[in-house]
């Protein structure tokens, strides 16, 4: 696996331990928490990043209306089980034998059950809607400039193929970025939209996962873009399975059909 040879660090994942013990004395980096060797030339999977995070010491309407089956990560952090490739296992359980099924981005898509709960397959999240509100700026953002800058960001910083950035919508002060990636579209070596979205989410929280870089400086024609609030909606290839009780009154979305929770990042 490639890593910075001079000081043996992982440019794309600061939550690693690196040493020159790879083949031929090459730098090899392993994710904290799992010890899994990671490829430092690309993004680390969200599952391994969440595991590492849990192991670390604690210190005119153009906007998209989320689909009724859209999920938002309501449950927050947990210590996930990852498969040998670093993907989320379809079934996740906690220490008290409470289990649930997750999608490919690790977000719960069923009611919680016990150890008898079956999750037959890992359901792919094929559509991610990133909903941002930027803080007021001295200069207005031009939609096409903003679109180009966000596409450049996902291409250059997160190494996501441009074809997976489906659209960028803007109605000041709300920006929406749509990522789409079906199972059939994702080729070997392609960054997963779920991983790109997670890196972006951490960046806009001021918690960059990249090694030795300052925070993300995002500019549109020189004007800095600062994010006040972020909401991420996840849509799966197969709709989630929640009980009617949850759909009618269990969520905080006021009777909405999606798992709805506002992440106030700042």
């Amino acid at each position: 696996h490639t890593a910075a040879q001079d000081n043996c660090t992982c440019p794309t994942n600061k939550m690693t331990v690196c040493s020159p013990d790879g083949p031929g004395g090459r730098c090899q980096c392993r994710a904290l928490g799992s010890g899994v060797a990671v490829d430092c030339s690309t993004l680390t999977s969200k599952c391994l990043l969440l595991k590492a995070r849990m192991s670390a010491p604690k210190n005119a309407r153009t906007l998209v209306r989320p689909n009724e089956h859209a999920l938002v990560d309501n449950d927050g952090l947990y210590d996930p089980d990852c498969d040998p490739e670093g993907r989320f296992k379809a079934r996740q359980c906690n220490q008290t034998s409470v289990c649930w099924c997750v999608n490919s981005v690790g977000v719960r898509r069923t009611d919680k059950g016990d150890l008898s709960l079956r999750c037959d397959e890992l359901v792919r999240t094929h559509h991610i809607l990133i909903d941002l509100r930027h803080r007021p700026t001295a200069g207005a953002f031009n939609h096409s400039d903003l679109d180009a800058e966000l596409r450049r960001l996902f291409r250059e910083r997160y190494r996501l193929h441009p074809k997976f950035v489906a659209a960028v919508h803007y109605e000041q002060p709300t920006i929406q970025i749509e990522l789409r990636q079906n199972t059939s579209q994702k080729a070997a070596g392609d960054v997963d939209i779920g991983d790109a979205a997670y890196y972006f989410e951490r960046d806009v929280k001021g918690e960059s996962l990249f090694q030795g870089r300052g925070g993300l400086d995002l500019r549109v024609r020189g004007e800095p873009l600062q994010v006040e609030r972020t909401l991420i909606y996840y849509l799966d290839e197969i709709p989630p399975k929640f009980s009617m009780k949850r759909l009618t009154g269990g969520g905080s979305g006021g009777g909405s059909h999606h798992h709805h929770h506002h992440h106030h990042h700042h």
Partner: antibody
Framework: QVQLVQSGAEVKKPGASVKVSCKAS????????INWVRQRPGQGLEWMGW????????KYNEKFKGRVTMTVDTSTSTVYMELSSLRSEDTAVYYC???????????????WGQGTLVTVSS | EIVLTQSPATLSLSPGERATLSCSAS?????IYWYQRKPGQAPRLLIY???NLASGIPARFSGSGSGTDFTLTISSLEPEDFAVYYC?????????FGQGTKVEIK
């Protein structure tokens, strides 16, 4: 450390132009904008504009539009501010200052160059 | 343009005393920035985004406020704090500064 070094003092005649340079070091030059601020004798601080070295974007104070031109030379990490049609009231200390920002915060103007005194006198 | 009015124009205090400097905006702004300027020196950033201490600035400096009224507080004046202080807004162009408050030794 981040440092901005400006060119030396200038004495100009009314109607002439002056070009002040600001050389940056200690950071990735293209990653933040360079602002120009002046202070006339006994007066407060007055913002003139900024230039963003990565793509050459600029924003000028309307008060100076048509008289001020900001340019960048990325090969030497230097920004230039040219003020034309000088008059006596342009006598001031001219400062460059960089503004770092992230998606989380705008870190203000920090640091500043040492200042360049421009005297306009016949 | 947004006009920032600082008060008082001059503040006469002794070392060890608390200094409270005000900055009032002609229309609502989201954040204010504070700078210190000493004779013959370039201004120095003290506070960014209203209340965040800039790198290397002592904790005796603090900022607060919202909307149109903002405050810079120096909890206990040190000899090196006697200077002119400016507030600045980044809400709309042109960027503007207050006229300054001079903190002098009583």
């Amino acid at each position: 450390q981040v440092q901005l070094v400006q060119s030396g003092a200038e004495v100009k005649k009314p109607g002439a132009s002056v070009k002040v340079s600001c050389k940056a070091s200690g950071y990735t030059f293209t990653s933040s904008d360079i602002n120009w601020v002046r202070q006339r004798p006994g007066q407060g601080l007055e913002w003139m504009g900024w230039i963003y070295p990565r793509d050459g974007s600029k924003k000028y104070n309307e008060k100076f539009k048509g008289r001020v031109t900001m340019t960048v030379d990325t090969s030497t990490s230097t920004v230039y501010m040219e003020l034309s049609s000088l008059r006596s009231e342009d006598t001031a200390v001219y400062y460059c200052a960089t503004r770092f920002a992230t998606v989380v915060s705008n870190y203000g103007l920090d640091p500043w160059g040492q200042g360049t005194l421009v005297t306009v006198s016949s | 343009e947004i006009v920032l009015t600082q008060s008082p124009a001059t503040l006469s205090l002794s070392p060890g005393e608390r200094a409270t400097l005000s900055c009032s905006a002609s229309s609502s702004v989201n954040y204010i920035y504070w700078y210190q300027r000493k004779p013959g020196q370039a201004p120095r950033l003290l506070i960014y985004d209203t209340s965040n201490l800039a790198s290397g600035i002592p904790a005796r400096f603090s900022g607060s406020g919202s909307g149109t009224d903002f405050t810079l507080t120096i909890s206990s004046l040190e000899p090196e704090d006697f200077a002119v202080y400016y507030c600045q807004q980044w809400n709309s162009y042109p960027l503007t500064f207050g006229q300054g408050t001079k903190v002098e030794i009583k």
